[in-house]
């Protein structure tokens, strides 16, 4: 019995930050959970983790050097990433696991979200020479 997750298929980012929402077919309320975000086709890099259970403020952290934070409501976890660069362009997968109460539950792998970080081009405006 797996939880379903909905993610936006594509996020194109002009700035260096992005908010990615993971909407679950399951209520987070009154449960102990571990919400995480993974980078790459094989989910090789754990980008961000949020641990909580609504009786205390969820703790959000990254072990892999990403700048991240998270917002949690009844059925949605929103990860906010900043200081992103072009080489962070990749596919990102949401994951949720419920540790308590039993039984342990996690989600069906989603289709992921492609986050495309656009390169910033510095425009130099040419001023015509003054006579």
């Amino acid at each position: 019995n797996k939880i379903l997750v909905k993610q936006s298929p594509l996020l194109v980012v002009d700035s260096n930050e992005v908010s990615l929402s993971c909407r679950y077919s399951y209520n987070l309320l009154a449960k102990e959970f571990r919400a995480s975000l993974y980078k790459g086709v094989n989910s090789d890099v754990e980008v961000c983790v949020g641990n909580g259970n609504f009786t205390y403020q969820p703790q959000v952290y990254s072990k892999t050097g990403f700048n991240c934070d998270g917002d949690f409501d009844n059925e949605t976890v929103t990860f906010r990433l900043w200081n992103l660069h072009v080489n962070h362009t990749d596919i990102y997968f949401c994951k949720i696991e419920f540790m308590y109460p039993p039984p342990y539950l996690d989600n069906e792998r989603s289709n992921g979200t492609i986050i495309h970080i656009k390169e910033k081009h510095l425009c130099h405006t040419q001023s015509s020479p003054k006579l």
């Epitope: 102990e32 571990r34 641990n51 909580g52 072990k63 696991e97 540790m99 308590y100 039993p102």
Partner: antibody, heavy 120, light 107 residues
Framework: QVQLQQSGPELVKPGTSVRISCEAS????????IHWVKQRPGQGLEWIGC????????NYNEKFKDKATLIVDTSSNTAYMQLSRMTSEDSAVYFC?????????????WGAGTTVTVSS | DIQMNQSPSSLSASLGDTITITCHAS??????LNWYQQKPGNIPKLLIY???NLHTGVPSRFSGSGSGTGFTLTISSLQPEDIATYYC?????????FGGGTKLEIK
């Protein structure tokens, strides 16, 4: 209070196997990993591997992959480590310890250790 | 695997002294570094987690600092009960690894 209760000392013959246990109490078993750590006499600490009771996923130190097998019984809140093909190098104290599944980076509670002696 | 190099391997100091133990990681582990104390014949006890956070019940004379690859454990105003071996441990990535230990003795 939170406790990890380990099984008693073992004297085993070379080439045989041994299974040691770690019974958890005083906390939600499925909220924490159980890790196993080896300490040879007068030596340092060596991480063997861990198991998460929720989905029984395991992580092993490559060095111990063919030596240790980790299992859990959630009905009794007990973790087990089986060590196979015992040699004198396996004589050590083995500790079980825990780390939080969602906040997994340190070991906050330790068992008293199980002394395993390999001798013919 | 991430190697954790701890120094010195042994240390002799007088009561009331301030001592420093260092731990060097073979790659960037950010702040995912913990310190443990193991008294002779006893189990390891968590002192400091995430480089600088004091575990519950640990005296404030213990402190930790550092990030990236370099970390230090400082014990100020050394007490007789501080005689122990101290270990660092990285919790950034599996397999978790420990430093070789620093054996602290009183002069």
């Amino acid at each position: 209070q939170v406790q990890l209760q380990q099984s008693g000392p073992e004297l085993v013959k070379p080439g045989t196997s041994v299974r040691i246990s770690c019974e958890a109490s005083g906390y939600t078993f499925t909220s924490y990993y159980i890790h196993w750590v080896k300490q040879r006499p007068g030596q340092g600490l060596e991480w063997i591997g861990c198991i998460y009771p929720g989905n029984v996923n395991t992580n092993y130190n490559e060095k111990f992959k063919d030596k240790a097998t980790l299992i859990v019984d959630t009905s009794s809140n007990t973790a087990y480590m089986q060590l196979s093909r015992m040699t004198s190098e396996d004589s050590a104290v083995y500790f079980c310890t825990r780390s939080h599944y969602g906040l997994d980076w340190n070991f906050d509670v330790w068992g008293a250790g199980t002394t395993v002696t390999v001798s013919s | 695997d991430i190697q954790m190099n701890q120094s010195p391997s042994s240390l002799s100091a007088s009561l009331g002294d301030t001592i420093t133990i260092t731990c060097h990681a073979s790659q960037n582990i950010y702040v995912w570094l913990n310190w443990y104390q193991q008294k002779p014949g006893n189990i390891p006890k968590l002192l400091i987690y995430k480089a600088s956070n004091l575990h519950t019940g640990v005296p404030s004379r213990f402190s930790g600092s550092g990030s990236g690859t370099g970390f230090t454990l400082t014990i100020s105003s050394l007490q007789p009960e501080d005689i122990a071996t101290y270990y660092c441990q990285q919790g950034q990535t599996y397999p978790y690894t420990f430093g070789g230990g620093t054996k602290l003795e009183i002069k």
